[in-house]
Interface confidence: low
């Protein structure tokens, strides 16, 4: 199973719980495959 930073982020894309920054900046989280070290 993938449990790295980017995998977790990828799985949680679409959930506001990932980071307060998502809400503050009014970004709509989308699963765009944002995977990086």
């Amino acid at each position: 199973a993938c449990d790295t930073a980017t995998c977790v982020t990828h799985r949680l894309a679409g959930l506001l719980s990932r980071s307060g920054g998502v809400v503050k900046n009014n970004f709509v989280p989308t699963n765009v495959g944002s995977k990086a070290f």
Partner: antibody, heavy 122, light 107 residues
Framework: EVQLVESGGGLVQPGGSLRLSCAAS????????ISWVRQAPGKGLEWVAE??????????HYAEAVKGRFTISRDNAKNSLYLQMNSLRAEDTAVYYC?????????????WGQGTLVTVSS | EIVLTQSPATLSLSPGERATLSCKAS??????VSWYQQKPGQAPRLLIY???NRYLGIPARFSGSGSGTDFTLTISSLEPEDFAVYYC?????????FGQGTKLEIK
Amino acid sequence: EVQLVESGGGLVQPGGSLRLSCAASGFTFSNYWISWVRQAPGKGLEWVAEIRSESDASATHYAEAVKGRFTISRDNAKNSLYLQMNSLRAEDTAVYYCASYFDYGLAIQNYWGQGTLVTVSS
Amino acid sequence: EIVLTQSPATLSLSPGERATLSCKASKRVTTYVSWYQQKPGQAPRLLIYGASNRYLGIPARFSGSGSGTDFTLTISSLEPEDFAVYYCSQSYNYPYTFGQGTKLEIK
């Protein structure tokens, strides 16, 4: 302006200890997952350790080569990251970089410091 | 541990030419691959993430492709400032790993 500034490097004898710091500014530090990555002189990049964001319980992961010897930690109030290095070996000699990562859904942010040199030698 | 093997070790080309760098993973990493550029005395700079996404401010001449175990970084027309060392990395499994690097030098 975004900045990551590492400090604390220097010359240490084998078996000794050193504590590296990484001071962050210009971004919401607590949201970021941060790693230490090292580079031995003339060699490639090697991941050392990672600490997750405050909302992810600041969970940590380590490379096998440093497990039990190095400890990564963060102080979000001070916008700082640390790497406590104990039982240092000659093979730990490297430039140590802190590298931050954050995904806000539409894209990512990735910042690196300029590095601090650690030399382990007698 | 996932091993990333980059080829060639050194690539000698002239400005204006096309560069193709390869990165092969020992296990499937889906698209959890990034590419970095590093110049002497500098920190690595992220170019590509998610195998094919250009990072902020990276020129369009840089592109990434691949999935599974085979990945490619292409520089369509080399500029003088592109001559550097390039590393691929994977963030699919701990430990994160990097390739050994490809040195892109001026012919």
